[in-house]
Amino acid sequence: APTSSSTKKTQLQLEHLLLDLQMILNGINNYKNPKLTRMLTFKFYMPKKATELKHLQCLEEELKPLEEVLNLAQSKNFHLRPRDLISNINVIVLELKGSETTFMCEYADETATIVEFLNRWITFCQSIISTLT
């Protein structure tokens, strides 16, 4: 059974994941982002089901494509590069989903834009956090 300290750690990790997903979305939704139209042409796979931590496997599998799309931003000056954000997200995802069991991700038939994709995983984090608090 999960202890109170392990639940707290999970909650904190989910909050950090949530913050960085929201950070990425903020940058994409910035009305001054000239690459937004191009970014929206790329399609992402969405999970058929995302209700448990093991379903983060579906997010992990889309992190490389996500980084590639974020690289389109090509800002003159990055506070954080796309690879910094994706690297941190990857570490958190691996810790949260664990590596004990291999879960085969099932994807929905419909693909999504980067904005829909990020919103889906933001909602996932918020939902899991709400069950832990």
Epitope: D20, M23, N77, H79, L80, D84
Partner: nanobody
Framework: EVQLVESGGGLVQPGGSLRLSCAAS????????MGWYRQAPGKQRELVAA???????NYADSVKGRFTISRDNAKNTVYLQMNSLKPEDTAVYYC?????????????WGQGTQVTVSS
């Protein structure tokens, strides 16, 4: 409006350490990047290190392994622990606060704190 207050600068000998702090106040959001930039006389401002509220970090190659950036989300404060300081680290260090991972005109900047590495 966001206000940034930096502290911790000073004179230190080569090989020494300093810890810079930057506290943000005002219209603070939970989603942010805070970082440290520096400008030496006659040079352009350059990134030293940055950190997101979610924990993503970015370091300039010249400071990797010597400097560590950390943050306290509850206090809206970012810290820069600088070890093994070199004379070439001498500069004015500026704190930055941004709501996006890339620089734009909505970013806020501190007044700067002088770091001098000299024997």
């Amino acid at each position: 409006e966001v206000q940034l207050v930096e502290s911790g600068g000073g004179l230190v000998q080569p090989g020494g350490s300093l810890r810079l702090s930057c506290a943000a106040s005002g219209s603070i959001f939970s989603i942010y990047v805070m970082g440290w930039y520096r400008q030496a006389p006659g040079k352009q401002r350059e990134l030293v290190a940055a950190i997101s509220s979610g924990g993503s970090t970015n370091y300039a190659d010249s400071v990797k392994g010597r400097f560590t950036i950390s943050r306290d989300n509850a206090k809206n404060t970012v810290y820069l622990q600088m070890n093994s300081l070199k004379p070439e680290d001498t500069a004015v260090y500026y704190c930055a606060y941004a709501s996006s991972w890339y620089e734009d005109e909505t970013d806020y900047w501190g007044q700067g704190t002088q770091v001098t590495v000299s024997s």
